[in-house]
């Protein structure tokens, strides 16, 4: 009896395992070997395909076959017994296009409130993925054990801590990778659960904010008590995407180690310019908080993003408002080289109910105002670039008052 | 592979001061820390300090400040500490070890034993 | 300084029993906790780290677990090569700080 070739021949490629699948085309003959050939492009002769040759199952394993992953390639698959089948040809691939990113491996830490994930790619040293290494993004899903809601988080890097959990409280959550030059998104790693510490003593420092003053730097924190000492450190940011490192070499801020107020002054010559990652941490002498939230920080943005200068000219329905350039120390103005947009805030003097106007022109009229009364103005500048979101602090408020009636001309 | 080798034993005598080293192999040492732990015959294991290679700085315990300094060379991928005015409670093995972030102190040099006597 | 101790300092056991050693610190320190086994005259044996992770090449019958101030290592089958001293170690702040370890001998 002839032999019939085997059919409905799948290839399947995660990461750099590559197998083989095919439907036996005659389930009543036993006994039955399965053999594959492979051809390169451009290449008349057919191969011996290793690790699947005389195949008893209906899956092979040919990894160790060192293939140029961007080349394409053909396959070929026959029946054995006595005699052969017929080759069937499968259609010619290129492994790079048909290989799916594989489950990433994922290491967790937990804090009371927090979860760090250390997330790295299954096979270390990939060759189908050895140019794109350093492009992988990771998507998570992260949910409570207990009420199982899911939340995702996209487009993180190889370490990502989520802040904000409740304690002693387990949390579970899977990662997969993507590749976006490629339009690649990979396989879901296992479930990963862990619980969160009891609640630390100490809680972390918030609300961190970066100001300049002069040549300086002014950094503020809130805390919940008072006795404590403080001490902050940096990290250059693109060392989150670096894939290989899981270590981060955090740097202290000398002028901040070891500081005894919810402040720190530091030169702006500390920083080169680039943007870094800060993140604040008390202690009491005997117990040390967990590490604040991180904030990013533009050296770029943030030494030129001052309160903005005004003039006010009183009518006695409304104020003309001027903006020009902040000033420097030693009276210089600062040039702004990218597109600001100005948030002004005013009240009346004897009340707390502040009004709000935002504006991208240097002159604002502030319309409806009551003569003779004193209002009260404050200002500030944001960048309207998405990437770069940074407001200036508020400026100080000035206080004027309208002119009496029938002055608006 | 990845290895620390550190020098030979010695002797020293009350007062004086021991420098040891740690060469590093299979691994670039400026993407890692070097950690410095000691242990006296016996006992057990005592952190003294860290150096970051890639710019030499370093943390100390309260214990050994002022009387230790670790240094590096990264020509030559190798770290050193160095312990001053030494006692005879000195005489320990001190070893080096590599840190690697949460996988912590996850290769140990063979330790060298460092022997304060008159 | 945080603080680290661990119970008990000596165990006695025999081949295939299961044995736990516990360590607490004095503070939260999360899970920046990392054991390792020592034999007379050898280095340190890096065997878990950040808890409850293992070292490759670390048998599965070692394993760790606990967060926050409370730490166990777990042998659950303890074999010839297993009768060492243990130590934890905090790598959350510094100081770091050791256990004073545990002894595990032949009964």
């Known amino acids: 009896k002839n032999l019939k070739s085997p059919q409905k021949v799948e290839v399947d490629i995660i990461d750099d395992n590559f197998i083989l699948r095919w439907n036996r085309s005659d389930e009543s003959v036993g006994n039955v070997t399965f053999s594959f050939d492979y051809q390169k492009t451009g290449m008349d002769n057919w191969i011996k395909l290793s690790g699947c040759q005389n195949i008893t199952s209906t899956k092979c394993n040919f990894s160790s076959l060192k293939l140029n992953v961007y080349e394409e390639i053909k396959l070929r698959i026959r029946a054995e017994k006595e005699n052969t089948s017929s080759w069937y040809e499968v259609d010619s691939f290129t492994p790079f296009r048909k290989a799916q990113i594989g489950p990433p491996e994922v290491h967790l830490e937990a804090e009371d409130k927090a979860i760090v994930i250390h997330i790295s790619p299954g096979t270390k040293d990939s060759v189908m993925w050895a140019l794109d290494g350093l492009s992988f993004t990771y998507s998570l899903v992260i949910w409570k054990n207990s009420s199982g809601v899911e939340e995702r988080i996209e487009n993180i890097y190889s370490r990502h801590k989520i802040y904000k959990l409740s304690p002693e409280t387990t949390y579970c959550l899977k990662v997969k990778a993507a590749l976006l030059t490629s339009w690649k998104i990979g396989v879901y790693s296992p479930v990963h659960c862990i619980k969160t510490t009891v609640e630390n003593e100490l809680p972390p420092p918030e609300n961190i904010e970066v100001s300049v003053q002069n040549q300086n730097y002014v950094l503020k924190w809130d805390y919940t008590y008072a006795n404590m000492t403080f001490q902050v450190q940096w990290l250059h940011a693109f060392l989150k995407r670096n894939p290989g490192n899981h270590l981060y070499k955090w740097k202290q801020i000398p002028d901040c180690e070891n500081v005894k107020t919810t402040q720190c002054v530091f030169p702006q010559n500390v920083f080169q310019k680039g943007i870094y990652l800060l993140r604040v941490q008390a202690s009491d002498g005997n117990n040390t908080s967990f590490w604040s939230e991180e904030i990013k920080f533009d050296t770029e943005i943030q030494a030129f993003l001052l309160p903005p200068v005004f003039n006010i000219r009183s009518l006695s329905d409304s104020f003309h408002i001027y903006i020009g350039a902040p000033k420097q120390s030693g009276n210089t103005p600062v040039i702004q080289d990218y597109p600001l947009i100005y948030e002004i805030i005013f009240w009346e003097n004897t009340s707390n109910a502040e009004r709000k106007i935002i504006e991208k022109k240097t002159d604002v009229t502030v319309p409806n105002l009551k003569p003779l009364t004193v209002y009260c103005v404050k200002a500030r500048a944001h960048t309207m670039d998405e990437k770069l979101n940074k407001s200036s602090v508020f400026s100080d408020a000035v206080c004027e008052k309208t002119k009496p009636g029938n002055t608006s001309k | 592979q990845v290895q620390l080798v550190q020098s030979g034993a010695e002797v020293k005598k009350p007062g004086a001061s021991v420098k040891v080293s740690c060469k590093a192999s299979g691994f670039n040492i400026k993407d890692y820390y070097i950690h410095w732990v000691r242990q006296a015959p016996g006992q057990g294991l005592e952190w003294m300090g860290r150096?970051?290679?890639?710019?030499?700085?370093?943390k100390y315990a309260p214990k050994f400040q002022g009387r230790v300094t670790m240094t590096r060379d990264t020509s030559i991928s190798t770290a050193y500490m160095e312990l001053s005015r030494l006692r005879s409670d000195d005489t320990v093995v001190y070893y080096c070890?590599?840190?690697?972030?949460?996988?912590?102190?996850?290769?140990w040099g063979q330790g060298t034993l460092v022997t304060v006597s008159s | 300084d945080i603080q680290m101790t661990q119970s008990p300092s000596s165990l006695s056991t025999s081949v295939g029993d299961r044995v736990t050693i516990t360590c607490k610190t004095s503070q939260n320190v999360g899970t920046n906790v990392a054991w390792y086994q020592q034999k007379p005259g050898k280095a340190p044996k890096p065997l878990i780290y950040s808890t409850s992770y293992r070292y490759s090449g670390v048998p599965s019958r070692f394993s760790g677990s606990g967060s926050g101030t409370d730490f166990t290592l777990t042998i659950s089958s303890v074999q010839p090569e297993d009768f060492a001293t243990y130590y934890c170690h905090q790598y959350f702040s510094y100081p770091y700080t050791f256990g004073p370890g545990t002894k595990l001998d032949i009964k």
């Open positions: 070890a590599r840190y690697h972030g949460y996988w912590a102190l996850d290769y």
């Open positions: 150096i970051d290679p890639e710019d030499a700085e370093t």
